[in-house]
Structure formats: C-alpha cells, structure tokens
Amino acid sequence: KIDTPQRGSIQDINHRVWVLQDQTLIAVPRKDRMSPVTIALISCRHVETLEKDRGNPIYLGLNGLNLCLMCAKVGDQPTLQLKEKDIMDLYNQPEPVKSFLFYHSQSGRNSTFESVAFPGWFIAVSSEGGCPLILTQELGKANTTDFGLTMLF
C-alpha cells in the first residue's frame, strides 16, 4: 500500500485551475504569477470495505496546508467544504471517513470525483468560472465535473 500522499495539479476542460481564496477553493483561468493549489491525494486503506465499481476511493487535500475536502449537508443540500485536517490522519483511521472520501474515476484524461458520503454528487465548477467548487448531481449541464489530474513526481 502507498502510505504517503501523491501530489497532483488539477484543471478543468476550460483550463481553469483551483486557487485557494479565503479558505475557499475557486476555479479561475490560469494567469501569470498565479499560484494554483497542489492537490494531495491518497487512496483509502480500507478499500475492501467500499463499493468496488465506482472508482478509487481517495482522500483529497491541499498539499502542505493541512486542509482536506469534505462533504457535509447544510440543510438538505450536500455541500463541499474545506476542513483543517491532516490527510494522513484520515488515512490511518480505523474506518473510512466517508465525509472526506471521493470515488476517483478516470476516463481517458478526464477525472471525476464522486462523494462517498453522498453517492451521485460530484465535485464541480460552474461553467462561468471564478466561482467556488461545489457538489452537483447534474452532470454535463451548467457545471463541469470533468477534470484533468496531472500527477507530480
């Protein structure tokens, strides 16, 4: 088992990158002197106890920042949040921490990230750009759920 997080960079099909702004992740067009976040990701060590056909269950964090992506309900609506959490602490937990887990599916160069806690809800960015990352159930409409993930070695 890999027991250190891998690092990667993410952009969407419109070449927008993820940037941290006031503890919120937003997707913006890449520009000079901009510093996109580097993603830290690690597979759940309890993979045998999660659904096998939805993708690789991973924890997603921001490299070097002790911040991880999680899903929580606000009212009846699943929302995407950044929480102060060490990704390795999540990895080592005795059970999958579903609120922090995403099924990572790859098709060609495209990656999707589906919430384990809220099946059918995917990390997305609004087609308009400059907006926070969200969770959506509506694939391929006003929101983009396909991302390019490039691993950094």
């Epitope: 999660l50 929480k83 005795p94 059970e95 999958p96 579903k98």
Partner: antibody
Framework: EVQLQQSGAELVKPGASVKLTCTAS????????IYWVKQRPAQGLEWIGR????????KFDPKFQGKATLTADTSSNTAYLQLSSLTSEDTAVYYC??????????????WGQGTTLTVSS | QAVVTQESALTTSPGETVTLTCRSS?????????ANWVQEKPDHLFTGLIG???NRPPGVPARFSGSLIGDKAALTITGAQTEDEAIYFC?????????FGGGTKLTVL
C-alpha cells in the same frame, strides 16, 4: 434521542444458531458503522466485528470469522448478529454499539443494553 | 494477538484527580492505536468517553480527558464525582482489529 435497543435474552442448545437484533432510533444506521462486542463473565470485552449498513460490507476479528455473521436492514434501521454452531464458549452478553465520526475521531459512543445468550442443553 | 492491560481496580475520593492507564503488549501505545475509553455502569449501561486518544464526544463532561503518558494511553478524571464509580475499558486499534483491555473498576469513596 439516539438509542440502540437489543432483543431479549436467549437460551439455546449447543450446535444451534441464534440471531440477535439491534434496532436503532434517533439516527440512520446508513450514516455510521455498527460494531458488535462480546462480554463474558469476568473476561472483559471482545470485539467481534463490524458492518457498514450503507453497503453491507463487514470486517471481523479473525477468531469470530465463520462463527459470526453480520447483516443489516436499513429499511427497519436494524442490525443483526447471527452466531452459529453454538457452544458453551458462546455464553455471554452481546452488545451492539455505534462507531461514529464526530469531525475529529471515531467513538464507540452509544451502546445497546446487551443481549444475554446462554448456551446449555 | 495483542494483549491490552489495565489496572484491575483503583480507588479515589470525590474531588480528587485519578488516572487510569492502558498498556499494549506490542510496545508503546501511539496515536495510531486510536485509543477509545468506555464507561460501564451497573445493568450493562455503556457510554463512550474518549476516542482517537484524546477527543471527547459531545455530552461527555470535561472532567474526562484522554492522553498518552509515557508508553501508555491514559484516562484522567479531574475532580472525580461519586457517579464516576464504574468500570472503565480501553480499546486499542491494531491495523485490522480492536482489542479491549480487561477494565478498571474505579471506586469513588
């Protein structure tokens, strides 16, 4: 109010099987893990295993593999422990407990009142 | 399989601070053992007190705290009360299974 209500005491003959129930109220079992624990007189607690009711996947202490079967019915918010090929060694109190994430850690937070199983001819 | 050892019995007085410990046969207890502490009162009434070594769930009084002391996990009750008289079990995680200690019977006289 979160509660785990377990079925009543059982007196069973050696070699038989028994199915114990644990009915949850105040929360949805799909949102947590249900663990089962065995307590024999003057012998402390033993972890039997767990079920994730959202997908029915189970894990066991190896010594209970083959002895215990864990299932759950999310429509009735109930978890089950089935014990087979019973012997006097299985005489004990069996507890279900919720293993729940609170944002920083998992906890054995709420427990059922226990089911006393007596195996005797 | 690992063996988890606790003091069999301790006695304290109301208002005193008492520390219960939990030792592992495999070596030092670490944060990766995610020590949990559970209280048992008469009539099989169990309550979770501490998870992940030092985290307290909602509703558990602040006088209960968890920590690592030397090579052991510890539960400290600061200002013990008569209603804290109970049996206290620790549980340690060993990568793929939980092992409970034998329990400490705490008397508050």
């Amino acid at each position: 109010e979160v509660q785990l209500q377990q079925s009543g005491a059982e007196l069973v003959k050696p070699g038989a099987s028994v199915k114990l129930t644990c009915t949850a109220s105040g929360f949805n079992i799909k949102d947590t893990y249900i663990y089962w624990v065995k307590q024999r007189p003057a012998q402390g607690l033993e972890w039997i295993g767990r079920i994730d009711p959202a997908n029915a996947y189970t894990k066991f202490d190896p010594k209970f593999q083959g002895k215990a079967t864990l299932t759950a019915d999310t429509s009735s918010n109930t978890a089950y422990l089935q014990l087979s090929s019973l012997t006097s060694e299985d005489t004990a109190v069996y507890y279900c407990t919720r293993f729940h994430w609170y944002g920083s850690s998992f906890f054995f937070d709420y427990w059922g009142q226990g089911t006393t199983l007596t195996v005797s001819s | 399989q690992a063996v988890v050892t606790q003091e069999s019995a301790l006695t304290t007085s109301p208002g005193e601070t008492v520390t219960l410990t939990c030792r592992s046969s495999t070596g030092a207890v670490t944060t990766s053992n995610y020590a949990n502490w559970v209280q048992e009162k008469p009539d099989h009434l169990f309550t979770g007190l501490i998870g992940g070594t030092d985290n307290r769930p909602p509703g558990v009084p602040a006088r209960f705290s968890g920590s690592l002391i030397g090579d052991k996990a510890a539960l400290t009750i600061t200002g013990a009360q008569t209603e804290d008289e109970a049996i206290y079990f620790c549980a340690l995680w060993y990568s793929n299974l939980w092992v409970f200690g034998g329990g400490t019977k705490l008397t508050v006289l």
